[in-house]
Interface confidence: low
């Protein structure tokens, strides 16, 4: 291609400017760039556009349609890392907040049309995780940190005055309604990056055009990694239904039982008053949040292919390479999907010593090709191990019995789960499903930690210890709903205190 | 021991410009938000603008808009709020101050002494 | 921007007594960023209570806030002599950041 010659770079200052080739001329055609911003942990990279202008096709249906020339971004490294967006058009990107360590652009133009482009500038802002965190957070439907570009719904009322941007807690216009009140209809949020999802606020509404009040009784909640694969949140075997309004402008708040990892939210009404009419706001924090718990790498791509090994593999497509949290749609599938507990072993070289301090554990889909049905499965329970050599291998310990933790797994093939411990030193981490589905055993992983300078381990923790709790952060542990007027927020705001 | 230490009292005729500095001492300048607060004799507390030292970005209140300006000197962990084209209504306390750490745009836990500026003819 | 009206101005009260001062926002404001001052005669405003009812390091017990929406409140149980002074109420939760007028608590 001849454009693309030098048009590649690293970013790692502080903060900058990322601009198409030639801005503010218009770019040149046959472009593969790629720019890469890079974090040091404990940074947090925030990306802002300022100008976005490219070609798009004028009968582009959706956002993400694009043709012709387009920008990716990728969280992580690019067609590694799982992609946030493809963008073209003249509508600019909203302010991206990575966490990862590594955000990533591509941007790709034809042969023809040329527009002005982009320019973007990033900045690093320092992120000291508390230790008493708590994961309640208001993750930006009321405040507008959720940008109109990440809500959307299976569909909207035919007025265009009751659109899913309109769906943000205490928004005075309106809220989303469907095209048809009935229970298929869903109202969908994508916070872009993996998060902890904690609760959920909702209202109904009142017409500003008629006054009438509408608003949803019950709803179900669907969780995704990827925008695919969908999960329908459970109390036990069944739905869960939660319990909503009683009325148009009082806000409940539904917390979950226990914390869900994920990208895609979906709201589906069950039950309505009048009509569906929603406003919302969901409540979480970022898996990094907490003490030492940057992702090491599998998810961004900062680990390499070559860092990842099991010890057997089914075919090329289910190597260890494969198992990647998120990124990858398939996953590490063992030789025998079926084998005996602690047999198998997938194992990931964090590259240096590290502290580790957890990690999240997903399931695969694919890997039956004799039959080609494609397999759905994943690790009810693990073990874990380490070693700073490679050589000596030690197993996370449950103090209360003195043998090797058996911790719990997943539930689902694509909803992740996070397992936390008392930190441990280690460059290499394994672990051995004990317990599977009845597809196999297949794992997809990310490791939890931070740099050995950072956090090193005590005396105490460096013996193999774990807490009994498997997840140590505060989070809200039991399922209610809760009326909380005009302001939902948790009341204890204990987590940040005054020095 | 977080310290926000302002400059001396100024008198300043109408039409020219006045420079307060704000030295912190007991963090990094470059993790916090400099905030500048204008308080007239008797009146309430006005919120002028603020500075992202590590960024050098800059917000100002639409009331003050092109006549204010936010700077900082990493080097010497120093604030400085200039404000031009004077007039009398400009006579006021102006304070520096900071939310703590890690709430940038929340609460101003630590303030400075304050600077009189007294803009007479 | 966000409007900010405290009542009442001002008050008169005795050592002992039970105060009350409301702020009003013109829009609602998330209990998260509305937050209180204290000021002296000639000095700076003092941070009393953020969040709309956590207190400030070294702020003693008999001050208290609360509130949601657009009503929020400061209260302080039992006045005490060195608590006559002029209180604001401030959000952060728009841009611009505002303050409500102040009350001017004094020694009736």
């Known amino acids: 291609k001849t454009g693309s010659e030098d048009c590649s770079k690293n970013f790692t200052s502080p903060n900058g400017t990322i601009e198409s080739p030639g801005f503010p001329e218009k770019y040149p055609h046959n472009l593969d760039c790629t720019f890469t911003i890079l974090a040091k942990p404990k940074m947090e990279i925030i990306l802002q556009f300022l100008i976005f202008d490219l070609e798009h096709d004028p009968l582009q249906v959706g956002e993400g349609d694009c043709k012709y020339d387009w920008l990716d971004i990728w969280d992580g490294i690019p067609h590694v890392g799982p992609l946030i967006g493809k963008y073209c058009g003249t509508k600019t990107p909203s302010e991206l907040r990575s966490s990862t360590g590594i955000l990533s652009l591509t941007f790709h133009t034809d042969m023809a049309v040329a527009k002005d482009g982009f320019s973007a500038r990033y900045y690093l802002v320092h992120q000291e995780p508390l230790e008493n965190f708590q994961c309640n957070v208001p993750l930006g439907m009321e405040s507008g940190r959720i940008a109109n570009e990440q809500i959307s719904a299976s569909s909207t009322y035919s007025d265009g005055r009751w659109t899913p941007q309109q769906s943000r807690l205490h928004g005075d216009d309106n809220g989303w309604t469907p095209n048809l009140d009935s229970n298929k209809e869903y109202l969908q949020v994508d916070l872009r990056f993996l998060t902890m999802l904690t609760a959920i606020a909702t209202q109904g509404a009142i017409s500003r055009e008629t006054q009438n009040g509408y608003y949803v009784k019950s709803y179900k909640l669907e969780v995704s990694t990827n925008g695919e694969d969908w999960m329908v949140y459970r109390h036990g075997k069944n739905h869960k239904v939660f319990q909503a309004n009683n009325d148009a402008t009082e806000v409940v708040l539904n917390k979950l039982h226990a914390p869900l990892l994920t990208r895609f939210v979906r709201i589906r009404p069950q039950t309505w008053h009048s009509g569906i009419a929603l406003r919302l706001e969901l409540f979480g924090c970022r898996v990094t949040d907490a003490p030492c718990s940057n992702m090491l790498g599998m998810l961004s791509g900062l680990i390499a292919d070559s860092q990842i090994s099991a010890s057997s593999t089914q075919e090329y497509l289910w190597s260890p390479s494969a198992a990647r949290l998120v990124s990858s749609r398939s996953g590490w599938f063992p030789r025998i999907p079926q084998a005996q507990p602690g047999e198998e072993w997938l194992q990931v070289d964090l590259g240096t010593p590290k502290t580790v301090k957890g990690v999240i554990i997903q399931g695969a889909r694919g890997g039956d090709s004799i039959t080609a049905v494609e397999a759905r499965a994943f690790v009810r329970k693990f073990k874990v191990s380490y070693s700073l050599n490679g050589k000596d291998w030690e197993y996370i310990q449950d103090p209360r019995t003195q043998q090797p933790k058996l911790f719990e797994g997943n539930m689902h093939y694509d909803t992740p789960d996070i397992r936390r411990f008392d930190p441990i030193p280690a460059q290499y981490v394994r672990v051995y499903p004990e317990r599977w589905s009845p597809a196999g055993i297949g794992m997809r992983l990310e490791v939890l930690g931070c740099d050995w300078t950072d956090s090193k381990p005590t005396v105490e923790t460096l013996g193999p210890t774990v807490k009994s709790e498997e997840t140590t952060t505060p989070y809200p542990t039991e399922e209610e709903a809760t009326e909380c007027g005009e302001n939902c927020s948790f009341e204890d705001d204990k987590d940040l205190q005054l020095p | 021991e977080v310290q926000l230490v302002q400059s001396g009292a100024e008198v300043k005729k109408p039409g020219a410009t006045v420079k307060i500095s704000c030295k912190v001492s007991?963090?990094?300048?470059?993790?916090?938000?400099i905030h500048w607060v204008q308080q007239a004799p008797g009146k309430g507390l006005e919120w002028m603008g603020r500075?992202?030292?590590?960024?050098?970005?800059?917000k100002y209140a639409p009331k003050f808009q092109g006549r204010v300006t936010i700077t900082a000197d990493t080097s010497t962990d120093t604030a400085y709020m200039e404000l031009s084209s004077l007039r009398s209504e400009d006579t006021a306390v102006y304070y520096c101050?900071?939310?703590?750490?890690?709430?940038?745009?929340?609460?101003?836990?630590?303030w400075g002494q304050g600077t009189l500026v007294t803009v007479s003819s | 921007d966000i409007q900010m009206t405290q009542s009442p101005s001002s008050l008169s009260a005795s050592v002992g007594d039970r105060v009350t001062i409301t702020c009003t926002a013109s829009?609602?404001?998330?209990?998260?960023?509305l937050h209180w001052y204290q000021q002296k005669p000639g000095k700076a405003p003092k941070l009393l209570i953020y969040?709309?009812?956590n207190l400030a390091s070294g702020v003693p017990s008999r001050f208290s806030g609360s509130g949601s929406g657009t009503d929020f409140t400061l209260t302080i149980s039992s006045l005490q002599p060195e608590d006559f002074a002029t209180y604001y109420c401030?959000?952060?939760?728009?841009?611009?950041?505002?303050f409500g007028g102040g009350t001017k608590v004094e020694i009736k």
């Open positions: 101050a900071t939310p703590i750490y890690g709430s940038r745009e929340a609460w101003f836990a630590y």
């Open positions: 007991g963090f990094n300048i470059k993790d916090y938000y």
């Open positions: 500075i992202d030292v590590e960024d050098d970005e800059t």
């Open positions: 829009s609602s404001v998330s209990s998260s960023y």
């Open positions: 969040r709309t009812s």
């Open positions: 401030h959000q952060y939760y728009r841009s611009p950041p505002t």
